[in-house]
Every structure is written in structure tokens, then in C-alpha cells.
């Protein structure tokens, strides 16, 4: 039985040209995390495998950095980066948990003058 829950940063916004950290946290389970996949829509951004470490998709190497922790840092943001991001936790013995984050990338002036979500 899957008892765990994924906590995410939820809906976030960031300035065009800036960076953002995508974070998920799995709680309420003793299951072992074997791998975390990060996806944007259906595209793989990165994998963090418990045994093998990080794999950053070659398509995103120029704009993605691993961490902190099991999170992922997106850099040099563009308006096209707006959309859904998913953290997919592969665990044993529970199975797969998925968290969703919605990122809105705003033009600099918009972000400065009243972004809907604050970036820590």
C-alpha cells in the first residue's frame, strides 16, 4: 500500500533570463527512493539514480543543473519554459509517486511589478 505523499513547490514564477529551483519532497513513507526523474511535459530533463548518480539530458545540459539535493535548477529561463514539470519518484517497495509543479516565466518588468508568486 502506498502511504507516501509528494510535497512540491506548487505554482511558482520566475523572471525571464533568471533561474529557478524545482523541489519535491517525499514524506510519510519508509520506502527507499531508487530514482527520481524530472520531466517537462513528456521530455526528460534529468535522472538522479541512487546507484549511478545524476544523468542530465544532453538536450538540456546548457540550461539545467543538478540539485540541490534531489531537486533541479533551471537556468537562463525563457517564456517557452512556462508549463508543467513533474518529479517522478521511483521507490521500493511502494512504486512510483509523481509530483507536479507549474512554472510561469514572466517578462522581467512583469515579474518586478507584481508577480503572483514570490521566489524565495
Amino acid at each position: 500500500m502506498m502511504t507516501g505523499t509528494i510535497e512540491t513547490t506548487g505554482n511558482i514564477s520566475a523572471e525571464k533570463g533568471g533561474s529557478i529551483i524545482l523541489q519535491c519532497h517525499l514524506s510519510s513513507t519508509t520506502a527507499q527512493v531508487t530514482q527520481v526523474n524530472w520531466e517537462q511535459q513528456d521530455q526528460l530533463l534529468a535522472i538522479c539514480n541512487a546507484d549511478l548518480g545524476w544523468h542530465i539530458s544532453p538536450s538540456f545540459k546548457d540550461r539545467v543543473a543538478p540539485g540541490p539535493g534531489l531537486g533541479l535548477t533551471l537556468q537562463s529561463l525563457t517564456v517557452n519554459d512556462t508549463g508543467e514539470y513533474f518529479c517522478i519518484y521511483h521507490t521500493y517497495p511502494d512504486g512510483t509517486y509523481t509530483g507536479r509543479i507549474f512554472l510561469e516565466v514572466l517578462e522581467s518588468s512583469v515579474a518586478e511589478h507584481g508577480a503572483r508568486f514570490q521566489i524565495p
Partner: antibody, heavy 117, light 113 residues
Framework: QVQLVQSGAEVKKPGASVKVSCKAS????????IHWVRQAPGQGLEWMGD????????NYNEKFRGRVTMTRDTSTSTVYMELSSLRSEDTAVYYC??????????WGQGTTVTVSS | DIVMTQSPDSLAVSLGERATINCKSS????????????LAWYQQKPGQPPKLLIY???TRESGVPDRFSGSGSGTDFTLTISSLQAEDVAVYYC?????????FGAGTKLELK
Amino acid sequence: QVQLVQSGAEVKKPGASVKVSCKASGYTFTNYWIHWVRQAPGQGLEWMGDIYPGGRYSNYNEKFRGRVTMTRDTSTSTVYMELSSLRSEDTAVYYCARYYESAMDFWGQGTTVTVSS
Amino acid sequence: DIVMTQSPDSLAVSLGERATINCKSSQNLLYNSNQKSYLAWYQQKPGQPPKLLIYWASTRESGVPDRFSGSGSGTDFTLTISSLQAEDVAVYYCQQYYNYPFTFGAGTKLELK
């Protein structure tokens, strides 16, 4: 020990398709990418694409897009590469290779595909 | 696509002498996050698949003799065989795995002088 064992040589006519298999053993199949690389007679190495057996991810060289399909069967730890609309220039040795983040460390023995009318 | 340019095309070296093969990339292969260059070197003998020698530009693969070494960062790389042995006669390829599509150099044929 890590092994990638490929299917045997194939002779095909132009316009046909070929499906080459690569059976993995000696490691956790779903953890590593499998890449396909080909080598025409007397020529260098050409990357065709990759597939991640642990998920639905694959990436193809634009040169082969629309003609190549990579699939996997986790129950048998086997990856397949199918190339369609074959032409004489596709005559080559086709290799599968294992990859994570630090290059292709184990290679299959190669499968010779000959396209001839 | 990233173009990998190898030089020389062929090289003849005497037993026990040093062999040097160069590889130049059309784009930077250094990933800022881990400060590693995504460049590998392979050895291929006739009728055999390529064999990984060096990855991340300078890390020797397990079981590879220490006479093989890799150096360089960013766009310029070198494979050095410090003291050539008869079994080193082969074709050597560099490969970038920084970005899709992965690309190889045209190869350097190493022969005995």
C-alpha cells in the same frame, strides 16, 4: 559480467526493414541507456539514437528520424532497433552500447546488415 | 551538430615511442555544473566493436593500461600513448556526448613504424 549480445547477420532488399536485437545481462537493465551506433564498411562510427529501458524516453539522430524505431522489452532485458526503407547505404555493422553519464562502456559484438538487390 | 575534428588521419610510431592524437570540438564540451568535459576516446581493432579507453576527457576506464592518458578541456583534447605496444595498433576515435546527436571524430589509424 556485463554482456550485450546482438542478433545475427541480416541480408535485406532495398525498401525492406530490419530489426536488430540487443540482449543485456550482468547489470540492472532499466538503469542504463542503450545507444545504437553503426559503421559502414571501411568508414567511421555514426550515432543513430538511444533508448532508456527504465522509461519511455528515446532520442533519434535527425538523419534517421522517421526510419528508425527503438523499443525495449524489460521482461527479456532486450532492446530492439528497427530501420525501415532500407537502401544500399544502410549496409553496415550495427552496434548497441550501454551508457549512463560517462560514455559507452560496454558494446555488443555487432550485427552486419547487408542491403542488396 | 557538434563537429569533432581528429588529427592526424594516420600515424606511424615505433615500438616504445610516444603516440599523440588530437581532437577538436566545434563547441564547448565542458559542463559547468560538474566541471567535466563530455569527451570519450575509443580504440577499435579490425572485426571488433569499439572499446572505451577514456571518458570525461581524462578518466581512464577500468582495466585500461596506464600508458593511455587523456587530457584537455572545453574544445581541445589529446589522447597520448606513452610507450607504444604492438597491441595498440588500431583505429582511435574521439566522441562527444555533451549534446544530441552524439558525434564521433573520423578516426586516427595508428600503425607501427
